[in-house]
């Protein structure tokens, strides 16, 4: 099923890509290209008799195109508003600049202390899991070599079961690897919430009547940090998948050689153990630092907030994360409205349905209206 998150990612990536290109590109929005990218998400789903996906696609594409235009128009406006918001917030915090900086600093250290054990734990787990994966797979290679040495009558019948086991074990272990490593990203999310909540409480006395604006900035920070956690999860998952892609051909190679000559098979089996070790070791080396890099990124984001709220803030492109957050919120809200309607539609009569569709179109217009209306 196509998710709100997938749609929002396609839209945001497309928007960022356009924004990085010439300004004119943003003016002449290539609607067709965005439509193509969104339609591509539905490609696999429409093979099945899937009215839900078809219906969603029909309503989503116009909504997304309109939301995208709004995004381009409101980007500059939002940048101004965020700038203004920050100015007011800085002015309010200026008399307490040292205390604010110190509080954020304390929070930063607290965050580092909180996250460090998790990064260590992730590093240890990567190492342990990689070793376990190696230990699990190596015996299959050894077993096959032994069978070949003992030169059983029918190599196909006596080697194939081991190759089949190896094939399944590769997949099972990679799945387990993902299952054991991705929860760390979810743990990080909890720590982010706790840290930002503490920061909110410690800065509240200084913000006074600009509390709303402070909250808004902290929401932006939380969004960025959680996005990092999601990226960490995706990177771990992608690395595990890549490991699977590299290991699977090793089992296939053996199975392919079962039909060939014994010499090719001997060579393939002799190399199998080494290849397994090499790929697993490479995975370990690549993934071990993920936790620390993630921690650094989070610390950097909090450091940026300290600068933003400090007296000597430069021009920061901070509005983009707010823009992305709003885009994601809008798409999420579109999806949940659509799902609600979908479940209601099943019990509605045709006249009720038609009436509801009219209302839906009006609602869709409203949903697209002004991204992130900020009170100044």
């Amino acid at each position: 099923e196509v998710s709100a998150d997938q749609v929002a990612t396609v839209m945001w990536d497309y928007f960022s890509q356009l924004s990085n290109n010439a300004k004119e590109a943003v003016e002449h929005l290539q609607k067709s290209e965005l439509t193509q990218q969104l339609n591509a998400l539905f490609q696999d789903k429409l093979g099945e008799v899937n009215t839900y996906a078809g219906d969603l696609q029909k309503k989503l594409v116009p909504f997304a195109t309109e939301l995208h235009e709004r995004l381009a128009k409101d980007s500059e406006k939002l940048k101004e508003e965020i700038g203004k918001e920050l100015e007011e917030l800085r002015a309010r915090l200026l008399p307490h600049a040292n205390e604010v900086s110190q509080k954020i600093g304390d929070n930063l250290r607290e965050l580092q202390q909180r996250l460090e054990p998790y990064a260590d734990q992730l590093r240890t787990q990567v190492s342990t899991q990689a070793e376990q994966l190696r230990r699990q797979l190596t015996p299959y290679a050894q077993r096959m070599e032994r069978v070949l040495r003992e030169n059983a009558d029918s190599l196909q019948a006596s080697l194939r079961p081991h190759a089949d086991e190896l094939k399944a074990k590769i997949d099972q272990n990679v799945e387990e690897l993902k299952g054991r490593l991705t929860p760390y990203a979810d743990e990080f999310k909890v720590k982010i919430d706790q840290t930002v909540e503490e920061l909110r409480r410690s800065l509240a006395p200084y913000a006074q009547d600009t509390q709303e604006k402070l909250n808004h900035q902290l929401e932006g920070l939380t969004f960025q940090m959680k996005k990092n956690a999601e990226e960490l999860k995706a990177r771990i998952s992608a690395s595990a998948e890549e490991l699977r892609q590299r290991l699977a051909p090793l089992a296939e190679d053996v199975r392919g050689n079962l039909r060939g000559n014994t010499e090719g098979l001997q060579k393939s089996l002799a190399e199998l153990g080494g290849h397994l070790d090499q790929q697993v070791e490479e995975f370990r080396r690549r993934v071990e630092p993920y936790g620390e890099n993630f921690n650094k990124a989070l610390v950097q984001q909090m450091e940026q907030l300290r600068q933003k709220l400090g007296p000597h803030a430069g021009d920061v492109e901070g509005h983009l994360s707010f823009l992305e957050k709003d885009l994601r919120d809008k798409v999420n809200s579109f999806f949940s409205t659509f799902k609600e309607k979908e479940s209601q539609d099943k019990t509605l009569s045709l006249p009720e349905l038609e009436q509801q569709q009219e209302q839906q179109q009006e609602q869709q217009q409203e949903q697209v209206q002004m991204l992130a209306p900020l009170e100044s």
Partner: antibody
């Protein structure tokens, strides 16, 4: 927990075909071979073959090649066995079973097939 | 095909007694042997794999041993709930093959 739910009993005429299903839950369906086993009263257990849902790969016991066709649908976590050109010899209980560590660690409840005119 | 021979078709024991089932492979299969229990009207259940590793949830009165061609399943203290057929199976060479089974009766 791992569960394999098979389709209900079948009564079919000689010469016909039948397709038995086995819906898996509680584990990563794509990453385990699914085996099929035949049991006739007084004849013990016979391994028919296996399918790998991850890529549709199959291996058949020579005795059942041409008789059984094994497939799997990842999206619904369901494995299928089609038996063709049925005769009374095919009357039996058929089990699907997940394969791991050179053994069949979880079994479906069985589907009884009766071939009779 | 590898033939798995369970020489006893039937075995009889009393509650609390020790009982052993044997299984002989027609050629060496290493340790890739499993044992199953099948109660009347039910599907087989895995008891032992890798010749001696107990499957999850299997009571410790069941133990497996052997390697190569000769394998044994032992129930240290038989219970009335153990009334069933017991099968051995190898899958280290295709096709996977089962023993003919031994029916355990409780006196």
């Amino acid at each position: 927990q791992v569960q394999l739910q098979q389709s209900g009993a079948e009564l079919v005429k000689p010469g016909a075909s039948v397709k038995i299903s086995c819906k898996a839950s509680g584990y990563a369906f794509s990453s385990y071979w699914m085996s099929w086993v035949k049991q006739r009263p007084g004849k013990g257990l016979e391994w028919i073959g296996q399918v790998y849902p991850g890529d549709g790969d199959t291996y058949y016991n020579g005795k059942f090649r041409g008789k059984a066709t094994l497939t799997a649908d990842k999206s619904s976590s369901t494995a299928y066995m089609q038996l063709s050109s049925l005769t009374s010899e095919d009357s039996a209980v058929y089990f699907c079973a997940r394969r791991d560590n050179y053994c069949l660690d979880f079994w479906g409840q069985g589907t009884s097939l009766t071939v009779s005119s | 095909d590898i033939v798995m021979t369970q020489s006893h078709k039937f075995m009889s024991t009393s509650v609390g007694d020790r009982v052993s089932f044997t299984c002989k492979a027609s050629q060496a299969v290493g340790s890739a042997v499993a044992w199953y229990q099948q109660k009347p009207g039910q599907s087989p259940k895995l008891l032992i794999y890798w010749a001696s590793t107990r499957h999850t949830g299997v009571p410790d009165r069941f133990t497996g041993s052997g390697s190569g061609t000769d394998f044994t399943l032992t129930i240290s203290s038989a219970q009335s709930a153990d009334l069933a057929d017991y099968f051995c199976q190898q899958c280290s060479t295709y096709p996977c093959t089962f023993g003919g089974g031994t029916k355990l009766e409780i006196k």
